[in-house]
């Protein structure tokens, strides 16, 4: 079960919870939004604070690291299961320095397999984060400091830290070094969403969300 | 195989103009930054340009502000840079460069033309 | 503007022999450097980015070390072929800046 299900089930109020993996026992915890846009938003990745590093292996995305009461990666491997069950919307809510917030909001997403290093898929984007997605499209496997699935010849992860989707290396990377403010800009390898603030600007803070499509 | 062919350059006069292009191809144009660097005769590498994978974002060489101008055409695989007002001391080698990355505040160039010869001369 | 500077400008060395070229930047770079070799007549050659990152097919003799200002680039065993002039490059802040440049010529 995800959040949405958490939240039908009479539950709705924000916090984390104990979800479990499409049939099967396993169980992951993850921070419910019960609040936002209707409820029922499975967090699946924050930042807000520096306080996790993210520079971590193939296994730790693909499990999940942090604190879901803070930053945190829910994990890929139950990402790609949720979303490959039913038809998932994904919401990224993006904070810069100077107070102003956005949001890119991806009609239909899901991850594929591990056997396909949980490529992204994505359609349909509408929002305030830029009318281009900053994740490039086609989607791109996922890439981490130790699994170079990219499309550089050099290694993404390595150069700019953090496991994202990257092409070479492409418009984003929201699990890129943490700066904080008056040091968050020309940093390429920081927070990135660049079809809302351009090359070289490090987000405050970032949250990914997914929840069903038609919840 | 990645090839970079750098075209227009010559000799003019001070105060003159020249347009460069560099015909790309063996590589998916529209993913790279791509730069211009020069190197006047007997001296070493300046940066003078490069211009992100949308063009929309350009940067230049304090040397070169205000008089050249980087500009590519996905469409046509093809970089330009337009150069007005030459000086002297801009007489040298102009290299169409393919960058490692998309990341524009970050140049590693990987891959070079073989470089067109500009002369500013009366 | 950061300032790169390279030591020594020219090295005279043999076959075999094992080069250092370094290359100090002005201000912290962190690790955002590249190390290019360039024949006579012929455009440059990425070697090395990242500091030490080595470019796809280049010799796993050449490396490179070193991160904030202070750089180096080392030829474990120079062959024929080295016998070029290196740049050293960085890539932390715009303009983006080469050294000097070093000659390493035949002994």
């Known amino acids: 079960r995800d959040c949405a299900e958490v939240f039908k089930s009479g539950h709705t109020t924000n916090g984390i919870y104990t979800l479990t993996f499409p049939n099967s026992t396993e169980e992951i915890k993850a921070y419910c939004d019960m609040e936002a846009g209707g409820g029922g938003w499975t967090i699946i990745q924050r930042r807000e604070d520096g306080s996790v590093d993210f520079q971590r292996t193939w296994k730790e995305y693909k499990v999940g690291f942090g604190n879901p009461s803070g930053e945190y990666w829910l994990g890929n491997e139950f990402v790609s299961q949720l979303t490959n069950q039913q038809r998932y919307v994904l919401k990224i809510h993006l904070k810069d320095w100077e107070g102003n917030e956005a949001y890119s909001l991806y009609e239909h997403f899901y991850l594929s397999s591990e056997e396909l290093n949980y490529r992204i898929h994505l359609k349909g984007l509408t929002g305030t984060a830029g009318k281009i997605s900053s994740i490039s499209q086609p989607g791109n496997d996922f890439s981490t400091k130790d699994g170079d699935n990219d499309k550089c010849i050099c290694k993404c992860s390595q150069m700019l830290t953090g496991g994202w989707w990257f092409d070479a290396c492409g418009p984003s990377n929201l699990n890129g070094m943490y700066y904080p403010q008056r040091q968050n800009t020309n940093k390429f390898n920081g927070i990135k969403w660049y079809y809302w603030k351009g090359s070289g600007y490090s987000l405050k803070a970032t949250t990914m969300m997914i929840r069903p499509a038609d919840f | 195989e990645v090839q970079l062919l750098e075209s227009g350059g010559g000799l003019v006069q001070p105060g003159g103009s020249l347009r460069l292009s560099c015909a790309a191809s063996g590589f998916t144009f529209r993913k790279y930054a791509m730069s211009w660097v020069r190197q006047a005769p007997g001296k070493g590498l300046e940066w003078v340009s490069v211009?992100?994978?949308?063009?929309?974002?350009?940067y230049y060489a304090d040397s070169v502000k205000g008089r050249f101008t980087i500009s590519r055409d996905n469409s046509k695989n093809t970089l330009y840079l337009q150069l007005n007002s030459l000086r002297a001391e801009d007489t040298a080698v102009y290299y169409c460069a393919k960058d490692l990355t998309d990341i524009v505040l970050m140049v590693y160039v990987d891959y070079w033309g073989q470089g067109t010869l500009v002369t500013v001369s009366s | 503007d950061i300032q790169m500077t390279q030591s020594p400008s020219s090295v005279s060395a043999s076959v075999g022999d094992r080069v250092t070229i370094t290359c100090r930047a002005s201000?912290?770079?962190?690790?955002?450097l590249a190390w290019y070799q360039q024949k006579p007549g012929k455009a440059p050659k990425l070697l090395i980015y990242a500091a030490s990152s080595l470019q796809s097919g280049v010799p796993s003799r050449f490396s490179g070390s070193g991160s904030g200002t202070d750089f180096t680039l080392t030829i474990s065993t120079l062959q024929p072929e080295d016998f070029a002039t290196y740049y050293c490059?960085?890539?932390?802040?715009?303009?983006?800046?080469f050294g000097g440049g070093t000659k390493v010529e035949i002994k």
């Open positions: 490059q960085q890539a932390n802040s715009l303009p983006f800046t």
């Open positions: 211009i992100s994978v949308s063009g929309g974002n350009t």
């Open positions: 201000q912290d770079i962190d690790r955002w």
